[in-house]
Protein backbone atom coordinates (compact mmCIF):
# COMPACT_ATOMS: atom_id res chain seq x y z
CA UNK A 1 0.00 0.00 0.00
CA UNK A 2 1.07 3.58 -0.62
CA UNK A 3 2.49 5.50 2.31
CA UNK A 4 -0.05 7.69 4.05
CA UNK A 5 0.10 11.41 3.30
CA UNK A 6 -1.85 14.10 5.12
CA UNK A 7 -2.77 16.89 2.73
CA UNK A 8 -3.80 20.39 3.78
CA UNK A 9 -4.38 22.01 0.39
CA UNK A 10 -4.62 25.64 1.55
CA UNK A 11 -1.56 27.38 2.95
CA UNK A 12 -3.78 30.13 4.30
CA UNK A 13 -7.43 30.93 4.85
CA UNK A 14 -8.88 34.35 5.65
CA UNK A 15 -12.23 34.66 7.41
CA UNK A 16 -14.29 37.58 8.68
CA UNK A 17 -14.92 37.64 12.41
CA UNK A 18 -18.25 36.03 13.26
CA UNK A 19 -18.20 33.73 10.25
CA UNK A 20 -17.19 30.07 10.03
CA UNK A 21 -13.79 28.86 8.87
CA UNK A 22 -13.35 25.65 6.92
CA UNK A 23 -9.95 24.00 7.29
CA UNK A 24 -9.44 21.28 4.70
CA UNK A 25 -7.53 18.06 5.27
CA UNK A 26 -7.49 14.72 3.45
CA UNK A 27 -5.54 11.55 3.99
CA UNK A 28 -4.34 9.49 1.04
CA UNK A 29 -4.94 6.12 2.71
CA UNK A 30 -7.22 4.36 5.18
CA UNK A 31 -4.10 2.71 6.55
CA UNK A 32 -3.10 2.81 9.31
CA UNK A 33 -6.34 3.00 11.26
CA UNK A 34 -6.36 5.78 13.79
CA UNK A 35 -7.89 9.15 14.53
CA UNK A 36 -7.18 12.57 13.15
CA UNK A 37 -6.53 15.42 15.54
CA UNK A 38 -6.38 19.12 14.75
CA UNK A 39 -3.96 21.39 16.59
CA UNK A 40 -3.18 25.08 16.56
CA UNK A 41 0.55 25.65 16.67
CA UNK A 42 3.34 23.12 17.06
CA UNK A 43 5.45 21.68 19.83
CA UNK A 44 4.55 20.84 23.41
CA UNK A 45 2.40 23.94 23.83
CA UNK A 46 0.17 23.26 20.85
CA UNK A 47 -3.56 23.62 21.43
CA UNK A 48 -5.94 20.75 20.68
CA UNK A 49 -8.75 22.06 18.47
CA UNK A 50 -10.53 18.84 17.55
CA UNK A 51 -10.12 15.15 18.32
CA UNK A 52 -12.02 12.75 16.11
CA UNK A 53 -12.10 10.09 18.79
CA UNK A 54 -12.80 11.86 22.03
CA UNK A 55 -13.64 15.15 23.73
CA UNK A 56 -16.28 17.84 23.32
CA UNK A 57 -15.59 20.61 20.81
CA UNK A 58 -18.78 22.69 20.57
CA UNK A 59 -17.49 25.11 17.93
CA UNK A 60 -15.94 22.46 15.69
CA UNK A 61 -17.79 20.13 13.36
CA UNK A 62 -16.31 17.67 10.87
CA UNK A 63 -17.18 18.56 7.29
CA UNK A 64 -17.58 14.88 6.38
CA UNK A 65 -19.39 12.35 8.52
CA UNK A 66 -16.60 10.59 10.44
CA UNK A 67 -18.63 7.36 10.43
CA UNK A 68 -18.85 7.37 6.64
CA UNK A 69 -17.21 4.34 5.10
CA UNK A 70 -13.86 4.95 3.35
CA UNK A 71 -13.80 8.43 4.87
CA UNK A 72 -10.50 10.14 4.18
CA UNK A 73 -11.76 13.71 4.47
CA UNK A 74 -10.89 15.13 7.85
CA UNK A 75 -11.76 18.76 7.13
CA UNK A 76 -13.33 20.73 9.96
CA UNK A 77 -15.50 23.80 10.26
CA UNK A 78 -14.97 26.21 13.16
CA UNK A 79 -17.95 28.44 13.88
CA UNK A 80 -18.15 32.01 15.14
CA UNK A 81 -14.54 32.92 14.43
CA UNK A 82 -12.94 35.65 16.55
CA UNK A 83 -9.51 37.29 16.20
CA UNK A 84 -8.31 35.01 19.02
CA UNK A 85 -8.70 32.05 16.63
CA UNK A 86 -5.96 33.28 14.32
CA UNK A 87 -2.97 30.97 13.96
CA UNK A 88 -1.64 27.99 12.04
CA UNK A 89 -3.72 24.84 12.22
CA UNK A 90 -2.31 21.34 11.70
CA UNK A 91 -4.19 18.19 10.75
CA UNK A 92 -2.36 15.29 12.39
CA UNK A 93 -2.92 11.58 11.75
CA UNK A 94 -2.46 9.17 14.65
CA UNK A 95 -2.06 5.43 14.63
CA UNK A 96 -4.54 3.60 16.82
CA UNK A 97 -2.93 2.46 20.05
CA UNK A 98 -2.85 2.79 23.81
CA UNK A 99 -2.17 5.64 23.66
CA UNK A 100 -2.60 6.62 20.01
CA UNK A 101 0.73 7.35 18.32
CA UNK A 102 1.33 10.49 16.24
CA UNK A 103 2.13 9.45 12.71
CA UNK A 104 2.07 12.32 10.25
CA UNK A 105 1.12 15.98 10.14
CA UNK A 106 -0.20 18.12 7.34
CA UNK A 107 1.79 21.18 6.29
CA UNK A 108 -0.51 23.53 8.21
CA UNK A 109 -3.07 26.14 7.24
CA UNK A 110 -2.70 29.68 8.53
CA UNK A 111 -6.02 31.14 9.59
CA UNK A 112 -6.17 34.92 9.52
CA UNK A 113 -9.23 36.70 10.85
CA UNK A 114 -10.55 39.85 9.26
CA UNK A 115 -11.96 41.88 12.14
CA UNK A 116 -13.59 45.28 11.78
CA UNK A 117 -12.16 48.20 13.68
CA UNK A 118 -14.31 49.57 16.47
CA UNK A 119 -16.03 52.91 15.89
CA UNK A 120 -13.35 55.60 16.18
CA UNK A 121 -13.57 57.61 19.39
CA UNK A 122 -12.28 61.16 19.17
CA UNK A 123 -11.32 62.99 22.34
CA UNK A 124 -10.26 66.58 22.61
CA UNK A 125 -8.21 68.60 25.09
CA UNK A 126 -9.08 68.54 28.77
CA UNK A 127 -9.13 72.36 28.97
CA UNK A 128 -10.37 74.95 26.52
CA UNK A 129 -8.00 77.07 24.49
CA UNK A 130 -8.42 80.36 22.71
CA UNK A 131 -8.02 81.34 19.07
CA UNK A 132 -4.57 81.06 17.54
CA UNK A 133 -3.68 78.31 20.00
CA UNK A 134 -3.04 74.74 18.83
CA UNK A 135 -5.00 71.94 20.46
CA UNK A 136 -4.63 68.18 20.12
CA UNK A 137 -7.37 65.71 19.27
CA UNK A 138 -6.89 61.98 19.71
CA UNK A 139 -8.64 59.26 17.72
CA UNK A 140 -8.64 55.62 18.82
CA UNK A 141 -9.97 52.44 17.21
CA UNK A 142 -9.39 48.87 18.33
CA UNK A 143 -9.77 45.19 17.52
CA UNK A 144 -9.07 45.17 13.80
CA UNK A 145 -7.18 42.67 11.69
CA UNK A 146 -5.24 42.56 9.42
CA UNK A 147 -2.89 45.34 10.52
CA UNK A 148 -3.12 47.50 7.39
CA UNK A 149 -5.37 50.48 8.05
CA UNK A 150 -5.73 54.06 6.82
CA UNK A 151 -6.62 56.98 9.06
CA UNK A 152 -7.41 60.52 7.90
CA UNK A 153 -8.32 63.72 9.75
CA UNK A 154 -10.68 66.42 8.51
CA UNK A 155 -11.72 69.80 9.84
CA UNK A 156 -14.99 71.00 8.35
CA UNK A 157 -14.42 68.69 5.39
CA UNK A 158 -10.87 69.81 4.75
CA UNK A 159 -8.17 67.18 5.20
CA UNK A 160 -5.60 67.88 7.89
CA UNK A 161 -1.95 67.04 7.56
CA UNK A 162 -0.55 67.74 11.02
CA UNK A 163 -1.11 64.41 12.78
CA UNK A 164 0.83 61.43 14.04
CA UNK A 165 -0.48 57.85 13.94
CA UNK A 166 0.60 54.63 15.63
CA UNK A 167 -0.66 51.08 15.11
CA UNK A 168 -0.01 48.67 17.97
CA UNK A 169 1.43 46.20 18.52
CA UNK A 170 4.29 46.48 16.06
CA UNK A 171 4.70 42.70 15.82
CA UNK A 172 2.28 39.93 14.89
CA UNK A 173 -0.95 39.89 16.85
CA UNK A 174 -4.49 38.55 16.66
CA UNK A 175 -5.82 42.11 16.50
CA UNK A 176 -4.52 45.66 16.42
CA UNK A 177 -5.28 49.14 17.71
CA UNK A 178 -4.70 52.53 16.12
CA UNK A 179 -4.15 55.83 17.89
CA UNK A 180 -3.71 59.12 16.08
CA UNK A 181 -3.17 62.64 17.42
CA UNK A 182 -3.98 65.65 15.26
CA UNK A 183 -2.94 69.23 15.98
CA UNK A 184 -5.56 71.86 15.15
CA UNK A 185 -5.07 75.63 15.19
CA UNK A 186 -8.18 77.34 16.57
CA UNK A 187 -9.80 80.46 15.14
CA UNK A 188 -12.57 82.60 16.61
CA UNK A 189 -14.93 81.15 14.01
CA UNK A 190 -14.49 77.54 15.18
CA UNK A 191 -17.40 77.27 17.61
CA UNK A 192 -19.41 75.38 14.99
CA UNK A 193 -16.40 73.55 13.58
CA UNK A 194 -15.99 69.80 13.72
CA UNK A 195 -13.01 67.49 13.45
CA UNK A 196 -13.54 64.08 11.90
CA UNK A 197 -11.34 61.03 12.21
CA UNK A 198 -11.93 58.61 9.33
CA UNK A 199 -10.74 54.99 9.42
CA UNK A 200 -10.61 52.81 6.29
CA UNK A 201 -10.01 49.05 6.52
CA UNK A 202 -10.38 46.04 4.23
CA UNK A 203 -13.29 44.76 6.34
CA UNK A 204 -15.35 47.91 5.75
CA UNK A 205 -15.92 47.38 2.01
CA UNK A 206 -14.95 50.95 1.16
CA UNK A 207 -17.34 52.48 3.69
CA UNK A 208 -15.03 54.07 6.27
CA UNK A 209 -15.90 54.55 9.92
CA UNK A 210 -15.96 58.06 11.31
CA UNK A 211 -15.57 59.57 14.72
CA UNK A 212 -16.27 63.22 15.36
CA UNK A 213 -15.54 65.88 17.93
CA UNK A 214 -16.99 69.38 18.12
CA UNK A 215 -14.51 72.20 18.54
CA UNK A 216 -17.13 73.88 20.73
CA UNK A 217 -15.87 71.55 23.48
CA UNK A 218 -12.30 72.75 23.02
CA UNK A 219 -12.55 76.44 22.27
CA UNK A 220 -12.98 79.55 24.33
CA UNK A 221 -13.77 82.81 22.53
CA UNK A 222 -13.18 85.70 24.93
CA UNK A 223 -15.58 88.66 24.75
CA UNK A 224 -15.08 92.17 23.44
CA UNK A 225 -16.40 94.86 25.81
CA UNK A 226 -17.87 98.16 24.65
CA UNK A 227 -19.52 101.01 26.50
CA UNK A 228 -22.29 103.22 25.20
CA UNK A 229 -24.10 106.03 26.98
CA UNK A 230 -27.49 107.50 26.27
CA UNK A 231 -28.19 111.23 26.77
CA UNK A 232 -29.01 112.52 30.23
CA UNK A 233 -32.65 112.00 31.05
CA UNK A 234 -34.85 114.70 32.60
CA UNK A 235 -34.55 112.99 35.98
CA UNK A 236 -30.76 113.40 35.99
CA UNK A 237 -30.18 109.76 35.27
CA UNK A 238 -27.76 108.44 32.65
CA UNK A 239 -28.26 104.99 31.09
CA UNK A 240 -24.89 103.36 30.52
CA UNK A 241 -24.64 100.00 28.71
CA UNK A 242 -21.83 97.49 28.69
CA UNK A 243 -21.95 95.34 25.59
CA UNK A 244 -20.24 91.96 25.93
CA UNK A 245 -19.78 90.62 22.43
CA UNK A 246 -18.75 87.49 20.55
CA UNK A 247 -17.97 85.17 23.45
CA UNK A 248 -18.18 81.40 23.92
CA UNK A 249 -19.09 79.44 25.99
CA UNK A 250 -22.04 81.18 27.62
CA UNK A 251 -20.69 80.90 31.17
CA UNK A 252 -20.17 84.55 32.06
CA UNK A 253 -20.58 86.82 35.08
CA UNK A 254 -20.74 90.63 34.81
CA UNK A 255 -20.17 92.98 37.71
CA UNK A 256 -20.76 96.76 37.71
CA UNK A 257 -18.54 98.85 39.94
CA UNK A 258 -19.17 102.54 40.75
CA UNK A 259 -15.97 104.19 41.88
CA UNK A 260 -14.61 100.76 42.72
CA UNK A 261 -17.64 99.62 44.72
CA UNK A 262 -19.73 96.70 43.54
CA UNK A 263 -23.06 97.93 42.32
CA UNK A 264 -24.57 94.83 40.73
CA UNK A 265 -23.59 91.32 39.62
CA UNK A 266 -25.36 89.39 36.88
CA UNK A 267 -25.00 85.91 35.36
CA UNK A 268 -25.60 85.32 31.67
CA UNK A 269 -28.29 82.77 30.89
CA UNK A 270 -30.46 81.64 27.97
CA UNK A 271 -28.79 83.96 25.49
CA UNK A 272 -29.60 83.77 21.79
CA UNK A 273 -26.81 82.34 19.68
CA UNK A 274 -25.06 84.28 16.92
CA UNK A 275 -24.69 82.65 13.52
CA UNK A 276 -21.10 81.72 14.36
CA UNK A 277 -22.14 80.11 17.63
CA UNK A 278 -20.94 82.91 19.89
CA UNK A 279 -23.09 85.00 22.23
CA UNK A 280 -23.70 88.70 22.83
CA UNK A 281 -24.96 90.21 26.05
CA UNK A 282 -25.86 93.78 26.97
CA UNK A 283 -26.11 95.05 30.53
CA UNK A 284 -27.54 98.46 31.50
CA UNK A 285 -26.75 100.64 34.47
CA UNK A 286 -28.71 103.75 35.43
CA UNK A 287 -26.41 106.32 37.03
CA UNK A 288 -28.08 109.02 39.15
CA UNK A 289 -25.83 111.97 38.37
CA UNK A 290 -27.42 114.24 40.92
CA UNK A 291 -26.29 111.91 43.69
CA UNK A 292 -22.64 112.54 42.85
CA UNK A 293 -20.47 115.60 43.41
CA UNK A 294 -17.53 114.31 41.48
CA UNK A 295 -17.05 112.35 38.30
CA UNK A 296 -18.23 108.74 38.47
CA UNK A 297 -15.83 106.00 37.39
CA UNK A 298 -17.89 103.06 36.10
CA UNK A 299 -16.26 99.68 35.58
CA UNK A 300 -17.81 96.79 33.70
CA UNK A 301 -16.04 93.70 35.00
CA UNK A 302 -16.55 90.45 33.09
CA UNK A 303 -15.45 87.03 34.29
CA UNK A 304 -15.77 84.58 31.38
CA UNK A 305 -15.59 80.81 31.75
CA UNK A 306 -13.53 80.92 34.91
CA UNK A 307 -10.81 83.09 33.37
CA UNK A 308 -9.31 86.19 35.01
CA UNK A 309 -11.71 89.14 34.93
CA UNK A 310 -11.72 91.60 32.02
CA UNK A 311 -12.41 95.22 33.00
CA UNK A 312 -13.60 98.13 30.93
CA UNK A 313 -13.87 101.51 32.66
CA UNK A 314 -15.84 104.59 31.77
CA UNK A 315 -16.02 108.02 33.42
CA UNK A 316 -19.24 109.94 33.76
CA UNK A 317 -18.38 113.66 34.15
CA UNK A 318 -20.50 115.48 36.65
CA UNK A 319 -20.92 119.29 35.88
CA UNK A 320 -20.20 121.94 38.52
CA UNK A 321 -23.91 122.95 38.55
CA UNK A 322 -25.83 119.79 38.20
CA UNK A 323 -29.14 121.36 39.28
CA UNK A 324 -29.24 124.04 36.56
CA UNK A 325 -31.88 123.44 33.96
CA UNK A 326 -30.57 122.42 30.58
CA UNK A 327 -27.03 122.00 31.69
CA UNK A 328 -25.07 119.14 30.10
CA UNK A 329 -23.44 116.31 31.83
CA UNK A 330 -20.51 115.22 29.76
CA UNK A 331 -19.53 111.58 29.55
CA UNK A 332 -16.10 110.38 28.59
CA UNK A 333 -14.95 106.90 27.68
CA UNK A 334 -11.55 106.65 29.21
CA UNK A 335 -10.71 103.78 26.89
CA UNK A 336 -9.16 101.67 29.61
CA UNK A 337 -9.71 98.02 28.92
CA UNK A 338 -7.99 96.14 31.69
CA UNK A 339 -7.84 92.44 30.96
CA UNK A 340 -6.11 91.27 34.08
CA UNK A 341 -3.33 88.87 33.33
CA UNK A 342 -5.02 87.44 30.24
CA UNK A 343 -3.39 88.11 26.95
CA UNK A 344 -6.30 88.35 24.50
CA UNK A 345 -5.74 89.21 20.90
CA UNK A 346 -8.85 90.88 19.57
CA UNK A 347 -7.82 90.67 15.95
CA UNK A 348 -11.28 91.28 14.53
CA UNK A 349 -12.43 93.75 17.21
CA UNK A 350 -12.76 96.52 14.63
CA UNK A 351 -15.52 94.63 12.85
CA UNK A 352 -17.80 94.44 15.83
CA UNK A 353 -18.03 97.92 17.32
CA UNK A 354 -21.41 98.60 15.80
CA UNK A 355 -23.05 95.27 16.52
CA UNK A 356 -25.03 96.33 19.56
Amino acid sequence: EEELQVIQPEKSVSVAAGESATLNCTATSLIPVGPIQWFRGVGPGRELIYHQKEGHFPRVTPVSDPTKRNNMDFSIRISNITPADAGTYYCVKFRKGSPDVELKSGAGTELSVRAKPSAPVVSGPAVRATAEHTVSFTCESHGFSPRDITLKWFKNGNELSDFQTNVDPAGKSVSYSIRSTARVVLTRRDVHSQVICEVAHVTLQGDPLRGTANLSEAIRVPPFLEFTQQSMRADNQVNVTCQVMKFYPQRLQLTWLENGNVSRTEMASALPENKDGTYNWTSWLLVNVSAHRDDVKLTCQVEHDGQPAVNKSFSVKVSAHPKEQGSNTAAENTGTNERGSSDYKDDDDKHHHHHH
Partner: antibody, heavy 119, light 110 residues
Framework: QVQLVQSGAEVKKPGASVKVSCKAS????????INWVRQAPGQGLEWIAM????????HYNQIFKDRATLTTDTSTSTAYMELRSLRSDDTAVYYC????????????WGRGTLVTVSS | DIVLTQSPDSLAVSLGERATINCRAS??????????IFWYQQKPGQPPKLLIY???NRDSGVPDRFSGSGSGTDFTLTISSLQAEDVAVYYC????????FGQGTKLEIK
Protein backbone atom coordinates in the same frame (compact mmCIF):
# COMPACT_ATOMS: atom_id res chain seq x y z
CA GLN B 1 -9.40 3.91 26.95
CA VAL B 2 -12.32 2.52 24.98
CA GLN B 3 -14.72 0.46 27.09
CA LEU B 4 -17.99 -1.25 26.17
CA VAL B 5 -19.93 -2.46 29.21
CA GLN B 6 -22.85 -4.77 28.50
CA SER B 7 -25.93 -5.58 30.55
CA GLY B 8 -26.22 -8.83 32.53
CA ALA B 9 -27.35 -12.29 31.48
CA GLU B 10 -31.02 -12.85 30.61
CA VAL B 11 -33.28 -15.91 30.64
CA LYS B 12 -36.32 -15.64 28.37
CA LYS B 13 -39.24 -17.80 27.30
CA PRO B 14 -39.73 -18.62 23.62
CA GLY B 15 -41.76 -15.90 21.88
CA ALA B 16 -40.58 -13.19 24.33
CA SER B 17 -38.28 -10.24 23.57
CA VAL B 18 -34.92 -9.28 25.02
CA LYS B 19 -33.19 -5.88 25.04
CA VAL B 20 -29.44 -5.91 25.62
CA SER B 21 -27.58 -2.68 26.41
CA CYS B 22 -24.00 -1.61 25.71
CA LYS B 23 -22.64 1.50 27.47
CA ALA B 24 -19.66 3.09 25.74
CA SER B 25 -16.93 5.21 27.31
CA UNK B 26 -13.44 6.49 26.49
CA UNK B 27 -14.36 7.93 23.11
CA UNK B 28 -16.89 10.14 21.32
CA UNK B 29 -19.88 7.83 21.02
CA UNK B 30 -21.41 9.49 17.97
CA UNK B 31 -18.24 9.19 15.86
CA UNK B 32 -18.15 5.40 15.51
CA UNK B 33 -20.41 2.57 14.41
CA ILE B 34 -21.61 -0.02 16.91
CA ASN B 35 -21.94 -3.61 15.68
CA TRP B 36 -23.85 -6.46 17.27
CA VAL B 37 -22.54 -10.01 16.87
CA ARG B 38 -23.75 -13.23 18.46
CA GLN B 39 -22.16 -16.57 19.17
CA ALA B 40 -24.21 -19.68 19.94
CA PRO B 41 -22.60 -22.15 22.37
CA GLY B 42 -19.68 -23.90 20.67
CA GLN B 43 -20.43 -22.13 17.37
CA GLY B 44 -18.89 -19.40 15.26
CA LEU B 45 -19.53 -15.62 15.09
CA GLU B 46 -22.68 -14.31 13.40
CA TRP B 47 -23.08 -10.62 12.55
CA ILE B 48 -26.52 -9.21 13.42
CA ALA B 49 -26.50 -5.51 12.53
CA MET B 50 -24.74 -2.16 12.94
CA UNK B 51 -25.82 1.37 13.89
CA UNK B 52 -24.33 4.85 13.47
CA UNK B 53 -25.14 6.68 16.73
CA UNK B 54 -24.79 10.10 15.10
CA UNK B 55 -27.87 9.68 12.93
CA UNK B 56 -29.23 6.19 13.79
CA UNK B 57 -28.45 4.86 10.31
CA UNK B 58 -28.62 1.05 10.50
CA HIS B 59 -27.61 -1.96 8.42
CA TYR B 60 -29.07 -5.38 9.20
CA ASN B 61 -28.16 -8.94 8.33
CA GLN B 62 -31.18 -10.09 6.29
CA ILE B 63 -31.62 -13.04 8.66
CA PHE B 64 -32.39 -10.64 11.56
CA LYS B 65 -34.06 -7.78 9.66
CA ASP B 66 -37.59 -8.55 10.88
CA ARG B 67 -36.75 -9.46 14.48
CA ALA B 68 -33.89 -7.18 15.57
CA THR B 69 -34.01 -3.45 16.29
CA LEU B 70 -30.95 -1.33 17.09
CA THR B 71 -31.24 1.98 18.94
CA THR B 72 -28.93 4.37 20.76
CA ASP B 73 -29.22 6.96 23.50
CA THR B 74 -26.51 9.55 22.82
CA SER B 75 -27.15 11.32 26.14
CA THR B 76 -25.88 8.23 27.98
CA SER B 77 -23.63 6.85 25.19
CA THR B 78 -25.58 3.61 25.25
CA ALA B 79 -26.49 1.28 22.39
CA TYR B 80 -29.35 -1.21 22.54
CA MET B 81 -30.22 -4.36 20.62
CA GLU B 82 -33.72 -5.75 20.93
CA LEU B 83 -34.52 -9.22 19.58
CA ARG B 84 -38.16 -10.27 19.36
CA SER B 85 -39.98 -13.58 18.93
CA LEU B 86 -37.20 -15.47 20.65
CA ARG B 87 -36.59 -19.13 19.84
CA SER B 88 -34.42 -21.68 21.57
CA ASP B 89 -31.78 -21.35 18.82
CA ASP B 90 -31.40 -17.66 19.77
CA THR B 91 -29.59 -18.85 22.89
CA ALA B 92 -26.17 -17.23 22.50
CA VAL B 93 -23.69 -14.71 23.82
CA TYR B 94 -24.50 -11.31 22.28
CA TYR B 95 -21.58 -8.93 21.78
CA CYS B 96 -21.47 -5.24 20.97
CA UNK B 97 -18.36 -4.07 19.16
CA UNK B 98 -17.12 -0.64 18.08
CA UNK B 99 -15.83 0.02 14.55
CA UNK B 100 -12.89 2.36 15.08
CA UNK B 101 -11.91 2.94 11.47
CA UNK B 102 -15.35 3.00 9.80
CA UNK B 103 -14.15 -0.06 7.90
CA UNK B 104 -17.15 -2.18 8.98
CA UNK B 105 -14.79 -4.08 11.25
CA UNK B 106 -14.87 -4.66 14.98
CA UNK B 107 -11.96 -3.11 16.85
CA UNK B 108 -13.21 -3.06 20.43
CA TRP B 109 -15.62 -5.58 21.94
CA GLY B 110 -17.85 -5.76 24.97
CA ARG B 111 -17.55 -8.85 27.20
CA GLY B 112 -20.85 -10.25 25.95
CA THR B 113 -24.32 -10.88 27.36
CA LEU B 114 -25.59 -14.45 27.61
CA VAL B 115 -29.23 -14.73 26.55
CA THR B 116 -30.81 -18.09 27.30
CA VAL B 117 -34.12 -18.94 25.65
CA SER B 118 -35.81 -21.84 27.40
CA SER B 119 -39.33 -22.89 28.20
CA ASP C 1 -24.01 -12.27 0.04
CA ILE C 2 -20.33 -13.05 0.16
CA VAL C 3 -19.60 -16.40 1.80
CA LEU C 4 -16.24 -16.92 3.54
CA THR C 5 -14.84 -20.44 3.86
CA GLN C 6 -11.92 -21.05 6.18
CA SER C 7 -9.54 -23.97 5.96
CA PRO C 8 -8.71 -26.04 7.78
CA ASP C 9 -11.47 -26.24 10.41
CA SER C 10 -8.83 -27.14 12.97
CA LEU C 11 -5.06 -27.15 13.02
CA ALA C 12 -2.40 -28.54 15.36
CA VAL C 13 1.07 -26.99 15.16
CA SER C 14 4.17 -27.47 17.29
CA LEU C 15 5.43 -24.58 19.42
CA GLY C 16 7.82 -22.42 17.43
CA GLU C 17 6.48 -23.70 14.12
CA ARG C 18 4.60 -21.76 11.47
CA ALA C 19 0.80 -21.88 11.41
CA THR C 20 -1.16 -20.97 8.31
CA ILE C 21 -4.93 -20.42 8.09
CA ASN C 22 -6.71 -19.76 4.80
CA CYS C 23 -9.87 -17.84 4.01
CA ARG C 24 -11.57 -17.97 0.62
CA ALA C 25 -14.33 -15.56 -0.45
CA SER C 26 -17.13 -16.55 -2.81
CA UNK C 27 -16.37 -13.39 -4.78
CA UNK C 28 -13.71 -10.71 -4.75
CA UNK C 29 -13.53 -8.57 -1.61
CA UNK C 30 -11.26 -5.98 -3.29
CA UNK C 31 -12.65 -2.47 -3.68
CA UNK C 32 -11.24 1.07 -3.81
CA UNK C 33 -7.73 -0.33 -3.79
CA UNK C 34 -8.21 -2.23 -0.55
CA UNK C 35 -8.84 -5.87 0.34
CA UNK C 36 -11.71 -5.83 2.84
CA ILE C 37 -10.65 -8.79 4.96
CA PHE C 38 -10.09 -8.79 8.74
CA TRP C 39 -8.75 -11.50 11.06
CA TYR C 40 -9.79 -12.07 14.69
CA GLN C 41 -8.49 -14.22 17.50
CA GLN C 42 -10.88 -15.60 20.13
CA LYS C 43 -9.64 -17.33 23.25
CA PRO C 44 -12.03 -19.42 25.39
CA GLY C 45 -14.40 -17.34 27.51
CA GLN C 46 -13.28 -14.05 25.90
CA PRO C 47 -14.64 -11.81 23.17
CA PRO C 48 -12.81 -11.83 19.82
CA LYS C 49 -9.80 -9.55 19.31
CA LEU C 50 -8.93 -7.81 16.05
CA LEU C 51 -5.54 -8.94 14.72
CA ILE C 52 -5.33 -7.85 11.07
CA TYR C 53 -7.29 -5.22 9.14
CA UNK C 54 -7.56 -4.67 5.40
CA UNK C 55 -5.90 -8.03 4.74
CA UNK C 56 -2.33 -7.20 5.75
CA ASN C 57 -2.20 -4.51 8.45
CA ARG C 58 -1.48 -5.49 12.05
CA ASP C 59 -3.72 -3.84 14.60
CA SER C 60 -2.19 -1.87 17.45
CA GLY C 61 -0.41 -4.08 19.99
CA VAL C 62 -0.49 -7.23 17.85
CA PRO C 63 2.84 -9.12 17.90
CA ASP C 64 4.71 -9.09 14.60
CA ARG C 65 4.67 -12.90 14.38
CA PHE C 66 1.12 -12.42 13.06
CA SER C 67 0.84 -11.40 9.43
CA GLY C 68 -1.86 -11.31 6.78
CA SER C 69 -1.64 -11.60 3.02
CA GLY C 70 -3.69 -12.20 -0.09
CA SER C 71 -5.95 -10.32 -2.46
CA GLY C 72 -9.14 -10.74 -4.44
CA THR C 73 -10.67 -13.96 -3.05
CA ASP C 74 -7.82 -15.80 -1.29
CA PHE C 75 -6.33 -14.69 2.00
CA THR C 76 -3.96 -16.14 4.57
CA LEU C 77 -3.23 -15.53 8.24
CA THR C 78 0.27 -16.67 9.21
CA ILE C 79 1.76 -17.12 12.67
CA SER C 80 5.48 -17.36 12.01
CA SER C 81 6.46 -19.00 15.30
CA LEU C 82 3.63 -20.43 17.35
CA GLN C 83 3.50 -19.50 21.03
CA ALA C 84 1.42 -21.23 23.71
CA GLU C 85 -0.78 -18.12 24.12
CA ASP C 86 -1.75 -18.31 20.43
CA VAL C 87 -4.06 -21.26 21.08
CA ALA C 88 -7.48 -19.91 20.04
CA VAL C 89 -10.13 -19.92 17.36
CA TYR C 90 -9.33 -17.62 14.40
CA TYR C 91 -12.00 -15.98 12.25
CA CYS C 92 -11.82 -14.08 8.99
CA UNK C 93 -14.39 -11.38 8.26
CA UNK C 94 -15.15 -9.47 5.09
CA UNK C 95 -16.70 -6.02 4.78
CA UNK C 96 -16.67 -5.31 1.07
CA UNK C 97 -20.41 -5.70 1.54
CA UNK C 98 -22.06 -5.99 4.94
CA UNK C 99 -19.95 -7.96 7.41
CA UNK C 100 -19.87 -11.76 7.31
CA PHE C 101 -17.58 -14.16 9.18
CA GLY C 102 -15.89 -17.37 8.20
CA GLN C 103 -16.82 -20.42 10.24
CA GLY C 104 -13.61 -20.28 12.26
CA THR C 105 -10.39 -22.34 12.53
CA LYS C 106 -9.38 -23.91 15.83
CA LEU C 107 -5.63 -23.75 16.43
CA GLU C 108 -4.07 -26.14 18.93
CA ILE C 109 -0.57 -27.10 19.95
CA LYS C 110 0.74 -30.41 18.61
Amino acid sequence: QVQLVQSGAEVKKPGASVKVSCKASGYTFTNYWINWVRQAPGQGLEWIAMIDPSDSETHYNQIFKDRATLTTDTSTSTAYMELRSLRSDDTAVYYCAMDYGSLYAMDYWGRGTLVTVSS
Amino acid sequence: DIVLTQSPDSLAVSLGERATINCRASKSVSSSGYNWIFWYQQKPGQPPKLLIYLASNRDSGVPDRFSGSGSGTDFTLTISSLQAEDVAVYYCQESRELPTFGQGTKLEIK
